[in-house]
Amino acid sequence: AVNGTSQFTCFYNSRANISCVWSQDGALQDTSCQVHAWPDRRRWNQTCELLPVSQASWACNLILGAPDSQKLTTVDIVTLRVLCREGVRWRVMAIQDFKPFENLRLMAPISLQVVHVETHRCNISWEISQASHYFERHLEFEARTLSPGHTWEEAPLLTLKQKQEWICLETLTPDTQYEFQVRVKPLQGEFTTWSPWSQPLAFRTKPAALGKDT
């Protein structure tokens, strides 16, 4: 089993959380494993217990401090180790030098709200959560709108190439129910990826005024 393929992937949320996934072909589901984080220039270290998320995949969150505290910087390197229990001892299964700001995945945007809605338009705003002040304005967003009779996968992506925490959706159909989602990504980091999608925001456009041509 050890010679099979494995995956050890971790992301930093830019503040005080490193989330990790460890997968190993042929590994036993009840194996007890953990991730240990040892920064090269900090006095703290942290451990989290890997919990099963699928047949041969485990995940955990290294909580480094208060959610909005800035626990790591661009110069930090964190040695991450996967340790699994074998009998009475812990055995190191994998090691990785982790540069937090090269491996970013932010929290999903929050507090989505309809600022203004009309028959064909809707203005929506949101906030980013637990994002480092280091980014300043170096963030981008993707948004998508779910139309009736379609799936999220079919929804065209709208790209906002700057830190803009609002959008004006246009060419909407009157008196129609829609859902909206947004995600965020820093411009920095070789292995940086998109945040999860936000919780969907449901809204309805206003009906067309009677007697008006729509």
Partner: nanobody, 121 residues
Framework: QVQLVESGGGLVQAGDSLRLSCAAS????????MGWVRQAPGKEREFVAG????????LYADSVEGRFTISKDNAKNTGYLQMSSLKPEDTAVYYC??????????????WGRGTQVTVSS
Amino acid sequence: QVQLVESGGGLVQAGDSLRLSCAASGRSLSTDCMGWVRQAPGKEREFVAGITWGTGSTLYADSVEGRFTISKDNAKNTGYLQMSSLKPEDTAVYYCAVDRYCYRGTVYRDWGRGTQVTVSS
């Protein structure tokens, strides 16, 4: 992609020592991990040792722990495997491999062509 070239293999007696080198080029290893994987005749590939390029954290297979030492020279972009107290069962082609992490397995992103180590009794 990283290009890897191994050297230092050869024929030695049981109990002797040998040092393998792995020269990396193509891009900076930065925070990559360099591993050594071996394949004996008629057997599957086997993880030997690994070292992270940033902090020098190491990982060894049980079969070589205490006998083999993995190290690196960042300035030369070269990794080393110092093999001591060699045994006939260490006979294999030794491959250098690089990925974002090292683990006790044999699937890595970049590979060298290998260097033959033969230990006679």
